[in-house]
Interface confidence: low
């Protein structure tokens, strides 16, 4: 006859281990006992327990309330156990010796091997603003045993490195993930994936790009002059800018103070109806934590009847 | 598979607190946070803040004054507590996992009924 | 203060149709944006995040869309167990809204 047992059994931390053990032998062969113990904890075999076919399972203290039988219908010739919540200290050489009759004793080997699968954590980097050279976004580290493997999954551009260390059970990794921040990237997920065997998917930690920025101002209202006279109504001018965090706009004349009546609100400078009082430079201030930026224009206010003349010119001339 | 299970009172006196534990598995509450969100009857939804999976918290700015939200990592529970309740605080209260893109809630628990009355 | 206004507040449809719900915010919130699904009795159920993105196990008829201030959220082909509440929320800063929902029901 012979034993059958596996190379390698493979489980995950937590999770119980089979250590088969499989006496494949003649007609009327009978296995007597099965001894199983570890044979790599350096300290010659270390035993786990003892199958016996008349008196059943003896756990020896070491293992006590860990190590059980498969649960039946078991075959007499079968002398697996089942090992309870394997831990990382179980990992190693196991031996099971069998003795049967007639035939006498056989040995197999196998190598338990425990996974431990990895608790990524992401951590951003500092704050991004635009115009910065290429700064760390985020770096992502997990360590399990094997070592784990770090990615990125993102649309936004940028460069990564990795770098491993090597602890006695297991090893982290841990990935960064530079770029150059544009405020394109506003709203961008950019996300760690790490993969492991001990995992059944791949774990996925996603981290939102916030990119400081503030765009140029300008001022929108003045396109046609012509509707620049005295006596409009609703006359307004609107300062458009864009940022993050979200800007906020203050206007000011720079030949004055605002005249009365002009009511500011927010990006919009509101006039009443325009006199050449209302004519001017203005200034929209537009800031940020980021920055700030500034955008003047000059308002003419026309007097209708002293462009009279002018308008008829403009007719006779086509 | 992922599961949040709450567990509180269905009813509360007037100006008492309330208190919902939501006892999560399937994953870890220090790599993903948890929201908690209500529906008062007949309405929409309503969030009431979040912890994230460091422990830090945000409140709704209409609730920070009587609410807290804590949790324990070993126990995988969060904590949720209310006070001072009032008729209208009368809700379905949720607890909700964080999903993937570090914002949304993509597993929710299956909800707390609270009618506030004497 | 920061508004999320759902449109339309009802909807009737019947099975096969397409219909579309849209949300608009008070600002841009650069996509930060989900949508959720609500039946009766029951707890919501993530759709989409990211404003675009279709959370694990969503069928591909429901869709995403938007930017800045507007998003909206596509069904192709309506199915008998797509009838229910739709909200939509916004993360872009706290309190993050929930838009007032979208009750779509059955024509």
């Known amino acids: 006859g012979e034993l059958e047992t596996s190379d390698v059994v493979t489980v995950v931390l937590g999770q119980d281990a089979k250590l088969p053990c499989f006496y494949r032998g003649d007609s009327g062969e009978q296995v007597g006992q099965v001894a199983w113990a570890r044979v790599d904890a350096g300290e010659g075999a270390q035993e786990l327990a003892l199958l016996h076919s008349k008196y059943g399972l003896h756990v020896s203290p070491a293992y006590e309330g860990r190590v059980e039988q498969p649960p039946p219908p078991r075959n007499p010739l079968d002398g697996s156990v089942l090992l309870r919540n394997a831990v990382q200290a179980d990992e190693g050489e196991y031996e099971c010796r069998v003795s049967t009759f007639p035939a006498g004793s056989f040995q197999a080997r196998l190598r338990l091997r425990v996974l431990v699968p990895p608790l990524p954590s992401l951590n951003p980097g500092p704050a991004l603003e635009e115009g910065q050279g290429l700064t760390l976004a985020a770096s992502c580290t997990a360590e399990g045993s094997p070592a784990p493997s770090v990615t990125w999954d993102t649309e936004v551009k940028g460069t990564t490195s990795s770098r491993s260390f090597k602890h006695s059970r297991s090893a982290a990794v841990t990935s960064e993930f530079h770029l150059v921040p544009s405020r394109s990237m506003n709203g961008q997920p950019l996300t760690c994936v790490v993969s492991h065997p001990g995992l059944l998917q791949d774990q996925r930690i996603t981290h939102i790009l916030h990119v400081s920025f503030l765009a140029e101002a300008s001022v929108r209202g003045l396109e046609d002059q012509n509707l620049w006279h005295i006596g409009r109504e609703g006359a307004m001018l609107k300062c458009l800018s864009e940022g993050q965090p979200p800007p906020s706009y203050n206007w000011t004349r720079l030949d004055g103070p605002l005249p009365s009546g002009v009511r500011v609100d927010g990006d919009t400078l509101g006039f009443p109806p325009l006199t050449t009082e209302h004519s001017g430079i203005y200034v929209c201030h537009v800031s940020n934590e980021f920055s700030s930026r500034d955008s003047q224009v000059t308002v003419d206010v026309l007097d209708p009847q002293e462009d009279s003349g002018k308008q008829v010119d403009l007719v006779s001339a086509s | 598979q992922v599961q949040l299970k709450q567990s509180g009172p269905n009813l509360v006196q007037p100006s008492q607190s309330l208190s919902i534990t939501c006892t999560v598995s399937g994953f870890s509450l220090t790599t993903y946070g948890a929201h908690w969100v209500r529906q008062s009857p007949g309405k929409g939804l309503e969030w009431l803040g979040v912890i994230w999976r460091g422990g830090s918290t945000d409140y709704n700015a209409a609730f920070m004054s009587r609410l807290s939200i804590t949790k324990d990592n070993s126990k995988s529970q969060v904590f949720f507590k209310m006070n001072s309740l009032q008729a209208d605080d009368t809700a379905i209260y949720y607890c909700a996992k964080i999903g993937y893109d570090g914002y949304a809630m993509d597993n929710w628990g299956q909800g707390t009924s609270v009618t506030v009355s004497s | 203060d920061f508004q999320v206004t759902q449109s339309p507040a009802s909807l009737s449809a019947s099975v096969g149709e397409t219909v579309t719900i849209t949300c608009r915010t008070s600002e841009n919130i650069h996509n930060y944006l989900a949508w959720y699904q609500q039946k009766q009795g029951k707890s919501p159920q993530l759709l989409v995040y990211?404003?675009?993105t279709l959370a694990d196990g969503v069928p591909s008829r429901f869709s995403g869309s938007g930017s800045g201030t507007q998003y909206s959220l596509k069904i192709n082909s309506l199915q008998p167990e797509d009838f229910g509440t739709y909200y939509c929320q916004h993360f872009w800063s706290s309190p993050w809204t929930f838009g007032g929902g979208t009750k779509l029901e059955i024509k």
């Open positions: 990211n404003a675009k």
